[in-house]
């Protein structure tokens, strides 16, 4: 009906467009307008023409879209109970939220060794600066010339922590650190998109009670059972893509003071102190080329001490003390932004339901009839291909019977046919441990539904 309406509307517009616009030169009013207001008329006619052309185009497009929709409807295989071809894949989902913070990068490589500067005059020794932090251990530098031993500076207080370096070459393996305290459990990640049904994972023991399912057949009322165990995990899914590193968590409270750590490599030397007031000037020698540093000469007699120099800048960091005992764990940092969700892994098999619900049942009488299994929220049947007494024994034991016998032609079930080619040895404690097709994969009809007769 919509198509016919659109076609009629299209014809009317075309007629109107042709008669009222293109043939307008022949009409008296058009001529009158033309003679009375030639410029104004042309402008109005042109804009009206554009509007009508746009309307006509829109109607044509709508018409084509409707025809396509009708084709989709009339050619839809589902209309005639024929399975259609699979549609093209949907567009890629939005990127998930940012991932948890990545692990910190390793220390960067050591800076290149600077060129040796010309020797400055000795200033009077300033007071020792505060101790700098232990530097990240760099690679061994080239051996420098032997310097005269300096006097040991007073231990400085630790300097501020340096910025994180770019990744360095692997250093020598350090001593094994103390075991850290266990981190708190992270928040649940965003769910991935639903994956294809995977191969059945091995069912585990009973899971905790799930959300209430749809109403089942009335059973004989029993007292509530104890909570069951969760099902065993299904096969592991493909790993998700790595999330974008989240921002660092807030700094935890500092741990208690540790025992002294093992000695770190010396940090870089601090800048020289400001020179003190010079002592009495010695005779100036003529400047030779700078030679290799000679051995230290005998100590000259002390000059008259000059006044104390201005306090020197911070001295080289002292050697790190021995390693401290591990501090108490800081408080957990704020959670990083969630990473984008990984691709969905192959779905594992659903575990046993919790409580005292069972995952197998007999439809018929309490111990003889059609064998059914519960999977993915639905009861379904078992195809009798390869179905034999060893399979029936396992099935019956799951219901607390001692013995089982395979039955055939026990009456057709409805709905899902869950299992086919079940091949148990008879010692398995659960049907899920037997060799069998993947859930829902079969070449059977309900005429071939398997049955059991269980006994004590």
């Amino acid at each position: 009906v919509q198509v016919l309406n659109l076609q009629a509307r299209l014809r009317v517009l075309e007629m109107y467009f042709l008669n009222d616009t293109l043939a307008a030169e022949d009409s008296p009013s058009f001529s009158l307008l033309q003679s009375a207001h030639p410029g104004e008329h042309l402008a109005q006619g042109a804009s009206r023409l554009q509007v009508l052309q746009a309307q006509l185009t829109w109607v044509r497009v709508s018409h084509e879209h409707l025809l396509q929709r009708v084709d989709n409807f009339t050619q839809n295989p589902g209309m005639f109970r024929i399975k259609g071809e699979q549609g093209a894949p949907g567009l890629q989902g939005h990127k998930g939220a940012m991932g948890m913070p990545g692990a910190p990068g390793p220390p960067g490589p050591p800076a290149e060794k600077g060129a040796k500067g010309a020797m400055g005059r000795d200033g009077a020794t300033g007071p020792s600066g505060p101790q700098g932090p232990p530097g990240v251990k760099g690679e061994a530098g080239l051996q420098g010339p032997q310097g005269a031993p300096g006097k040991q500076g007073a231990t400085g207080t630790p300097g501020p922590q340096g910025e994180k370096g770019s990744k360095g070459d692997g250093g020598l393996i350090g001593p094994k650190g103390e075991t850290g305290t266990k981190g708190e459990k992270g928040d649940l990640g965003l769910p991935g998109s639903k994956g294809d049904r995977g191969m059945k994972g091995d069912a585990g023991v009973m899971g905790p009670p799930g959300a209430q399912g749809s109403k089942g057949d009335f059973g004989r009322p029993g007292p509530p059972g104890l909570a069951g165990f969760p099902g065993a995990k299904g096969d592991q899914g493909q790993p998700g893509l790595q999330g974008v590193p989240g921002p660092p968590g807030a700094v935890g409270h500092p741990g208690a003071k540790g025992e002294p750590g093992s000695a770190g490599s010396p940090g870089r030397a601090g800048l020289p102190g400001s020179p003190g007031s010079p002592g009495a000037t010695g005779l100036k020698g003529s400047k030779g080329d700078t030679g290799l540093q000679g051995q230290q000469g005998r100590k000259g007699e002390s000059g008259v001490p000059g006044p104390a120099g201005v306090k020197g800048e911070q001295g080289s960091p002292g050697l790190a003390g021995p390693k401290g005992a591990p501090g108490q764990a800081g408080q957990k940092g704020d959670q990083g932004v969630k990473g984008s969700s990984g691709e969905q892994g192959v779905k594992g098999e659903k575990g046993e339901r919790g409580e005292n619900s069972v995952s197998v049942r007999i439809v018929g009488s309490s111990n003889r009839g059609r064998a059914e299994v519960y999977y993915s929220g639905t009861w379904g049947t078992i195809c009798d291909d390869e179905w034999q007494n060893s399979d029936a024994i396992v099935f019956c034991r799951m219901l607390g019977y001692s013995k089982g016998r395979a039955l055939y032609k026990v009456g057709a079930g409805t709905g899902q046919i869950w299992l086919d080619n079940v091949q148990c040895r008879g010692t398995e404690s659960t049907l899920w441990s037997c060799t069998k097709n993947s859930w829902g994969h079969h070449d059977c009809s309900h005429e071939e539904d398997a049955g059991v007769e269980c006994s004590v």
């Epitope: 009973m206 059972g225 005292n356 034991r397 013995k403 404690s429 004590v456």
Partner: antibody
Framework: QGQMQQSGAELVKPGASVKLSCKTS????????ISWLKQKPGQSLEWIAW????????TYNQKFRGRAQLTVDTSSSTAYMQFSSLTTDDSAIYYC????????????WGQGTSVTVSS | DIVMTQSQKFMSASVGDRVSVTCRAS??????VGWYQQKPGQSPKVLIY???FRYSGVPDRFTGSGSGTDFTLTITNVQSEDLAEYFC?????????FGGGTKLEIK
């Protein structure tokens, strides 16, 4: 919280029989499996059999079939194991334990009954 | 019958240590494995079921892992009250079978 109370120690002669009891409370007896296990001093555990109180069905370890006989009394929520043709090798502690399904671990255990077979 | 092998009969640890008790099945038992702790003169207690699920009330320093044929019980931050014997058990097939046990001694 479930509990399982076993009968007291037994001293029996070779060739005799002994009947051990296991009284349960704190869970629905009829919808649970009761297993019996044997542990010789300083050794590991051996599973003898289970009985499902809801049906009376029993699954045995073939090693003990014919000598261990399991029964239940649902009115008193008690399980029994009668062990016959005893030899000195049967001297051990015997435990009862419950599991919710045959394919689940044993989560409640009795305190054990010591059986000594000696002439 | 499926044989469960615990290769270490004894293990020694100091308080605060981390220890791993291993168990190997003679054939695939999927994840149908439990771990039990038995203190001297007491009944066994279940710690882990389905290979990696901690039973309710069990301290989180006990963790289980593995599937197929190789399984591990790990105790981190060992405490003096962990002095006990540890058994693995498969309940995938009848008869159920147990490992020979691993005794943990505290130094």
């Amino acid at each position: 919280q479930g509990q399982m109370q076993q009968s007291g120690a037994e001293l029996v002669k070779p060739g005799a029989s002994v009947k051990l009891s296991c009284k349960t409370s704190g869970f629905t007896f009829s919808s649970n499996y009761i297993s019996w296990l044997k542990q010789k001093p300083g050794q590991s555990l051996e599973w003898i059999a289970w009985i499902y109180a809801g049906t009376g069905g029993i699954t045995y370890n073939q090693k003990f079939r014919g000598r261990a006989q399991l029964t239940v009394d649902t009115s008193s929520s008690t399980a029994y194991m009668q062990f016959s043709s005893l030899t000195t090798d049967d001297s051990a502690i015997y435990y009862c334990a419950r599991h919710v399904r045959g394919y689940h671990p044993m989560d409640y255990w009795g305190q054990g009954t010591s059986v000594t077979v000696s002439s | 019958d499926i044989v469960m092998t615990q290769s270490q009969k004894f293990m020694s640890a100091s308080v605060g240590d981390r220890v791993s008790v291993t168990c190997r099945a003679s054939q695939n038992v999927v994840t149908n494995v439990g771990w039990y702790q038995q203190k001297p003169g007491q009944s066994p207690k279940v710690l882990i079921y389905s290979a990696s699920f901690r039973y309710s009330g069990v301290p989180d320093r006990f963790t289980g892992s593995g599937s197929g044929t190789d399984f591990t019980l790990t105790i981190t931050n060992v405490q003096s009250e962990d002095l006990a014997e540890y058994f693995c058990q498969q309940y995938n097939n009848y008869p159920y079978t147990f490992g020979g046990g691993t005794k943990l001694e505290i130094k």
